[in-house]
């Protein structure tokens, strides 16, 4: 028997520095977690103790903090090189700055193979990107060889900016011939490493003949066997065992997100490459693990540029940006409109001639808007200003919801109106009218939504049985502020870009902004 240790990360999302327990900015260092310096300590400890170790990343290193905003992926290549990753799969967020924003900082600089079997380049891009990422890589590990086959969410064109010259094929269809090829070349230990979410990971384990282990990402899935060490609730045991269609037991793993855990899976293979046993657990990277001094020093050196960036002007406002709780928790506020407009703008994807865009709607809890911005400071808006407005380090995500769920959400928005509570929704691409004289749960008297399948966008009444795409904060997608119906009833959830980054990009693009209060949210006569 031959034993392999797989160390894995996924959805790190630019958390190069240690973070608080909820993966936001580290405040009390003695209680902080993760970060590449701490990760390196643990990885090196395991490499020294065990003979056959692979360090893998299942995608979405890009996007999430000011590190990515400033360094644009160069930080990913640099620190992943320093940690000596063995392979990485492309995630959807690796395309956030377009193909060039992937090629130059990451693909050309990474000293580890970057993989995806289901992304095919065409046209002029084919020769430019040739060899910069691979469908698979065969790695010598100890006395054996291991094949790593990559995959990426086929939804990437709707979630990011891969352009028109990359085709995202069905994962299973694309993986099978690559695995078959490796088998014919006597590679009998094969890991599928990819970024399509836990449901697809399980399908790959079930359907792709010859895959021995699946290491996934995208859905931020936390798996654990035994008593979990922090706040995350396990979605299943680690590893999650799938019985394949040809009767094999295939371990599937994922390691939550944000570099908080290091996935640790031990696999035992027989001489024919069959998995005999698999066991392990994610390792919580808490403060009991010291940060590696040399990596930490490097982080501090790279940090300097971030501090300078946060005070530079992004753009100007010529109006007061009303982000006060007195406004945003009670009525339409122009800060809410600005943020929602930025959220929609960030999700413009012309992927189908029938649609002007794939999504037109935004909702945003008023309680998530934490500060106004005064225009009387020469109109200057900085990252620092935006960090005061959006201090929680969240993301603006894409969900699919039925109209009936949206209706419930808007009822929840005003179910206890008047108490300055955070659930009051700011909107984009939506016209809502409330009648507060009616009883809670029956206060939405009009709800019109902007069409997407149209050449001239216009507002139509919400249809209860129709499925709609909506951009919203991850806080809401996870049921925050009492929006349990969103969490329980959403049909799809894809994590998006860092909130501040979305707004800062929009402001930089517009240069001068003047958001108005324009009648998106109304109260019917006599009730307000």
């Amino acid at each position: 028997a031959w034993e392999l240790t797989i160390l894995h990360t996924n959805d790190v999302h630019s958390r190069l520095e240690q973070t608080s327990e909820d993966s936001s900015k580290c405040v009390n260092a003695s209680r902080c977690m993760g970060g590449v310096a701490r990760l390196f300590t643990k990885v090196q400890q395991i490499r020294r103790a065990e003979p056959n170790v692979l360090l893998l990343d299942a995608g979405d290193q890009y996007q999430g903090t000011i590190w990515f905003t400033v360094y644009k992926g160069a930080e990913v290549a640099h620190f992943m090189n320093a940690l000596r990753y063995d392979a990485m799969a492309l995630g959807n967020h690796e395309f956030d700055n377009g193909v060039e924003g992937l090629i130059e900082p990451l693909l050309k600089e990474a000293k580890f193979p970057i993989l995806s079997a289901n992304i095919k380049a065409k046209g002029p891009l084919a020769s430019q990107i040739s060899g910069l990422y691979l469908p698979y890589k065969v790695l010598p590990v100890g006395d054996e060889v291991v094949g790593i086959v990559g995959y990426t969410s086929k939804e990437t064109p709707f979630l990011s900016n891969p352009g028109t010259n990359l085709v995202f094929e069905d994962e299973i269809t694309a993986l099978q011939p690559e695995v078959d090829k490796l088998k014919t070349l006597n590679v009998n230990k094969i890991i599928a490493l990819g970024h399509s979410g836990f449901e697809m990971d399980k399908l790959i384990a079930q359907k792709v003949r010859g895959v021995d282990v699946v290491v996934g990402g995208h859905s931020n899935t936390f798996l654990y066997t035994g008593n979990p060490p922090s706040k995350e609730v396990p979605a299943g045991k680690y590893p999650f065992i799938v019985t394949s269609d040809d009767g094999r037991k295939v371990p599937v793993v994922q390691a939550y997100a944000f570099g908080k855990y290091l996935g640790y899976l031990k696999i035992e293979f027989d001489e024919r490459g069959n998995v005999i046993s698999s066991h392990g657990n994610p390792i919580l990277l808490n403060s009991s693990i010291p940060e590696d001094p040399s990596i930490k020093a490097d982080i501090n050196k790279w940090r300097i540029k971030l501090d300078n960036y946060s005070t530079q002007e992004l753009g100007k406002t010529i109006v007061y940006l009303d982000g006060s709780s007195q406004s945003c928790r009670f009525r339409e506020c122009n800060m809410g409109n600005l943020i929602c407009d930025a959220m929609i703008n960030n999700n413009l994807r012309h992927t189908d001639e029938m649609f002007w865009n794939h999504v037109s709607m935004c909702i945003l809890n008023g309680g998530g808007i934490r500060s106004p911005i005064d225009e009387r400071n020469n109109g200057t808006i900085t990252w620092e200003n935006l960090a005061a407005v959006l201090p929680f380090g969240g993301t603006f995500d894409l969900v699919q919801l039925k109209g009936s769920t949206l209706k419930k959400a808007f009822e929840h928005s005003v179910h206890r109106y008047g108490q300055s509570t955070g659930e009051f929704l700011q909107v984009g691409g939506i016209h809502v009218v409330y009648d507060l004289s009616r009883k809670p749960g029956d206060r939405v008297v009009k709800l019109d939504v902007l069409c997407t399948k149209c050449r001239v966008p216009s507002y139509d009444p919400l249809k209860m049985d129709e499925v709609y795409k909506v951009i919203l904060p991850n806080f809401l997608a996870n049921g925050g502020d009492g929006f349990q119906m969103i969490k329980d009833e959403l049909l799809r959830h894809d994590s998006g870009d860092q909130d501040i980054n979305v707004v800062s990009t929009y402001i930089s693009k517009m240069k001068v902004i003047y958001p108005a209060v324009e009648g998106r949210i109304k109260f019917s006569t006599g009730s307000h």
Epitope: F112, G131, L134, V141, G142, L185
Partner: antibody
Framework: QVQLVQSGAEVKKPGASVKVSCKAS????????MDWVRQAPGQRLEWMGD????????IYNQKFKGRVTITRDTSASTAYMELSSLRSEDTAVYYC???????????WGQGTLVTVSS | DIQMTQSPSSLSASVGDRVTITCKAS??????LSWYQQKPGKAPKLLIY???RLIDGVPSRFSGSGSGTDFTLTISSLQPEDFATYYC?????????FGQGTKLEIK
Amino acid sequence: QVQLVQSGAEVKKPGASVKVSCKASGYTFTDSNMDWVRQAPGQRLEWMGDINPNNGGTIYNQKFKGRVTITRDTSASTAYMELSSLRSEDTAVYYCARTNWDYAMDYWGQGTLVTVSS
Amino acid sequence: DIQMTQSPSSLSASVGDRVTITCKASQDINSQLSWYQQKPGKAPKLLIYRANRLIDGVPSRFSGSGSGTDFTLTISSLQPEDFATYYCQQYDVFPRTFGQGTKLEIK
């Protein structure tokens, strides 16, 4: 700068064994795999095997059917290639070569001529 | 094992010429191809890896292209020091295999 310095030329009788050394300097020895390649007179290059100096793991070209053994001494930053049951067709220049992150051979030793003759 | 076939086996050219050497693999090698230059009595020197990535310090007149099974090494303007034997090698799978070499001679 990276340097790989190999041991000197050897003359061996058929059936004997030869052990060639390769001393590495200018980089962290355990950070890169070391391959061994040979070149018989007028022939193409032939890959023999690979060692991971970090854990001693080896992968061999099956053509050499247990005749080749690659080892390393990390304290001396040196890799070794031993070829046993020598025959006249093993007469060749033997090279060690460091592999880069992608497993292409980026630095080569100067070569060691092994002559097998009765 | 994957067979690597180079063409031509030998080639005569003059300083300033543009020269192309091809290498064909017996099956798809996933861009895992390198090119080496070897001068008489010397060890091979890596020029290009991953089919088209030029090694630091190698003159930009050398370039690599190709994917799948067909690959090309191009020298855009031959210099006197470029006369040597060139080898391609696949490192996609084990065992690693080399082409038979292309000897580039002065016309």
